[in-house]
Amino acid sequence: QEEDLPRPSISAEPGTVIPLGSHVTFVCRGPVGVQTFRLERESRSTYNDTEDVSQASPSESEARFRIDSVSEGNAGPYRCIYYKPPKWSEQSDYLELLVKETSGGPDSPDTEPGSSAGPTQRPSDNSHNEHAPASQGLKAEHLYHHHHHH
């Protein structure tokens, strides 16, 4: 019998309020044994996959998706889903990325730390909409190529 897969969680480092031009990393977490993490973005047809999965703890694996220079177009809700053979998990809750103009420059520490969306209640959107997707300029750290969409 197939195991019941826990829903993934999603968080953002250094936070969910990011100054224009700064970097942000989405961290997707799931159980050990995950083969692929996918980052999707609400109302977008794009998505990002990575098989660069690391072990975050004895019971958890994670993948990281980095945007090097955040633009206004990167703002919006993001979510994760993962593939642990032989099936996909449910989606995580959405995590909203806010991009704000700042005079402090890219290194300004003007962010909200520790923001995350864990495997709590079901998403409020249609949970069968398994791809309302992902983002411009995203890459899995160390390996994912840079997408550019107009």
């Epitope: 998505y47 398994e130 309302a132």
Partner: antibody, heavy 116, light 110 residues
């Protein structure tokens, strides 16, 4: 990477028929596969899809008339009770990497003829 | 139910000219939109995805533009090889928008 349809043939009305889309050279689990048909001399008509996460989606006209299912290497389209109006070339297609909206990988199609 | 209304049904243009094809969606579908080219006896070929992104290997003479719920495909510097039928498609199969094809536009080069 390629997809290829098979199973098309001449059947009489009401005879169930299963078409198979076989994936090669890529991991099917990552992709949505859509089924599309084209009657002779007509335009493309959307039938439905099997999503990467295991859901199925049907055009409203196709609900109850077809069933889509998948294995690790194939996506099947079962026509439960075909009529002469179902005579068409049936295509399956896979979307591109990184974007669900564009289907760049299409099979050559398989011809289904429904006639008494 | 999502409906894509594609116009015109057919168009004729000269080599070197420009053709514009429009697709009007019955609801907002965002970037869940693509354009295809199909020649007789062949499978469809992806031209534009995500409403405005050029597919790999496709000439930059093809351009996709989105304005609200109206999508436009422009083919410039027409060549004889552009004679084909062109289709628009929305393919959000997650039940938010739905999936459908436009009725097609036959492009004749004279």
């Amino acid at each position: 990477a390629a997809v290829k349809e098979s199973g098309g043939r001449l059947v009489t009305p009401g005879t169930p028929l299963t078409l198979t889309c076989t994936a090669s050279g890529f991991s099917l689990y990552k992709y949505n596969i859509q089924w599309v048909r084209q009657a002779p001399g007509k335009g493309l008509e959307y039938i439905g899809a099997s999503t990467y996460a295991g859901y199925t989606y049907y055009a409203s006209w196709a609900k109850g008339r077809v069933t889509i299912s998948r294995t690790s290497t194939t996506v099947d389209l079962k026509m439960t009770s075909p009529t002469t109006e179902d005579t068409a070339t049936y295509f399956c297609a896979r979307h591109i990497d990184g974007d669900y909206s564009g289907y760049a990988l299409w099979g050559p199609g398989t011809l289904v003829t429904v006639s008494s | 139910e999502l409906v894509l209304t594609q116009t015109p049904a057919s168009v004729s243009a000269a080599v070197g000219g420009t053709v514009t094809i429009k697709c009007q969606a019955s609801q907002s579908i965002g970037t869940w939109f693509a354009w295809y080219q199909q020649k007789p006896g062949q499978s469809p070929k992806l031209l534009i995805y995500g409403a405005s992104n050029l597919a790999s290997g496709v000439s930059s003479r093809f351009k996709g533009i989105r304005s609200g719920t109206e999508y436009t495909l422009t083919i410039s510097d027409l060549e004889c090889a552009d004679a084909a039928t062109y289709y628009c498609q929305c393919s959000d199969v997650g039940n938010t928008y739905g999936a459908a094809f436009g009725g097609g536009t036959e492009v004749e080069i004279n």
